[in-house]
Structure formats: C-alpha cells, structure tokens
C-alpha cells in the first residue's frame, strides 16, 4: 500500500531560522500537499513535478523545494512564532495518503531551553483520518457522490 514517510517528527527552531520537512513516497502521485493542521487545516503548498508550485501567500518568498514530488524536501525560511504547528504531507494518489506529521516549534531564542521536542512522533489524534477510498470515483461509483447543494458557503 502507498504510504508517506515524513521527517522529522518534531523540530524546535528559533525565530528567523529555517526548517526542512521531507515527504517521501513510492511514486505514482498526481501531486503533494503540505498542510498545517488545526480546526481549519490550511494549505501551505501544493507541489507537482514540472509546474510552478502553489504556495500560500503567508509563505511566499520564504519557502524552497528540492527533489521531486516522490521525494520532496520543503524548506521554510525566516520562521515566525505564528508558524508553530503540525505540518503534514498529503500525497494525492488513487487513495489519498497522509504523512505522520511534523511538529514545528518556533521559539524565542532565549526560551529555547523551555521548549524541546520529544522523540515521539506527533500524536495521531492531531491528524486527519487517512482516507481509504478513491480520490476520483469511477463512473460506476459516482452514485455515492453527494447531491450538489443549492448553495455552499466558502470559508
């Protein structure tokens, strides 16, 4: 089964520093998202080989990429306290697959000693449940699609 290997599990960095997050899969992707988890998960980047990556305006100008969508390293620069959070890779395949998440702790330099990562990966409860079905249903499964609502509010 397809899975996403994500590293590191956790990293503590001072304000202004950079962090690398690596997402590796066995291939066969349409693309890969990096999402910051929370009550309203936020898309940070969408990366697809051969095209210009899509980057959230909050990170524009301070994010770099190396590798390919199958083995992608995302470098976030000039980190701010507000960037603290859990970031997860999501591979878009026939089945959507999530990485285990990277907890990024951005701290004031003088408080580095107070905030340290443990060796444990981020708690699974913080991650969305890995989906198990097809991202693009075949016509014969299309009856499972919800009816289009009359109106749908955007966040």
């Amino acid at each position: 089964a397809q899975e996403v290997q994500q590293s590191p599990h956790c990293t503590t960095v001072p304000v202004g520093a950079s962090v690398n997050i690596t997402c590796s899969t066995s291939g066969g992707l349409r693309g890969i998202y990096l999402r910051q988890l929370g009550p309203q998960p936020q898309d940070i980047i969408y990366y697809e080989d051969g095209v210009v990556p899509t980057t959230d305006r909050r990170f524009r100008g301070r994010i770099d990429f190396s590798g390919s969508q199958d083995n992608l390293t995302i470098t976030m620069h000039r980190l701010q306290l507000s960037d603290t959070g859990t970031y997860t890779c999501q591979a878009i395949t026939e089945v959507n697959v999530y990485g285990s998440g990277t907890l990024v702790l951005v701290t004031e330099e003088q408080s580095q000693g107070w905030h340290r990562c443990s060796d444990a990966p981020p708690r699974a409860s913080a991650l969305p449940a890995p989906p198990t079905g097809s991202a693009l249903p075949d016509p014969q499964t299309a009856s499972a699609l919800p009816d289009p609502p009359a109106a749908s509010a955007l966040p």
Partner: nanobody
C-alpha cells in the same frame, strides 16, 4: 451564500463545440482540484475530468481527445472545452472544487448547466 457559478451550456448540433466556465468566488482557488461531472437523465453522475492545482488534467475515457480542461488562476475560473460533441454528451454539467481532504469530492458545487447535443 456563495457557490460556484457555471455558464456556457446550451443546445449544439452533433460535431459542434461548447465551452463551459466555472467561476470560483474565493481566494483559495489555486489550492483546489477543480472537477467537472455530468449527469444525464436517468443515469448516475459521472466524472468528466479534473485538473490539479498545478494544471495537470485527468479525463474519463469517454471524453479523452475531445474535451479539454484548463484553469485561469488570475480569473479564479476553470474551463471545459468540449469539441466533437455527441448526443450521448447530453447532460447537466456540474463544477466541483475540492481540496482532496476527504476520499471523494465534498467541497463546493455549482448549480449545473444544461448541455444538449441534438440535430
């Protein structure tokens, strides 16, 4: 309330062309997979095709080589160019915007636009 707005449907003769548009009224357009689905009378809704945030399109076998999906991030709009139309393409066409957070399209839908292919 806000929703996707499709346009461009209508009556066309077999072999003709139409271009459908779907406007996304939100700033996050560039992160969404944009899909086109269709539903013919008495049939299940089916995928026509979709386009990734990066602009790579995927099509159902029944429309490959005839239909083209594109997106314009400056206009927050996705297009479905339909050429060599056949009577079996007659259906209501729906636009879907989906961030692929769940296992099936669950984001935002348009109200649908009718396409009728008939002589």
């Amino acid at each position: 309330d806000v929703q996707l707005v499709e346009s461009g449907g209508g009556l066309v003769q077999p072999g003709g062309s139409l271009r459908l548009s779907c406007a996304f009224p939100g700033s996050a357009f560039s992160f969404y997979f944009m899909g086109w689905y269709r539903q013919a009378p008495g049939k299940q809704r089916e995928l026509v095709g979709d386009i990734t945030p990066g602009g790579t399109a995927n099509y159902a076998d029944s429309v490959k080589g005839r239909f083209t999906i594109s997106r314009d991030s400056a206009k927050n709009t996705v297009y479905l160019q339909m050429n060599s139309l056949k009577p079996e393409d007659t259906a209501v066409y729906y636009c879907n915007a989906d961030r692929r957070v769940t296992i099936r399209p669950d984001g935002y839908w348009g109200q649908g636009t009718q396409v009728t292919v008939s002589s």
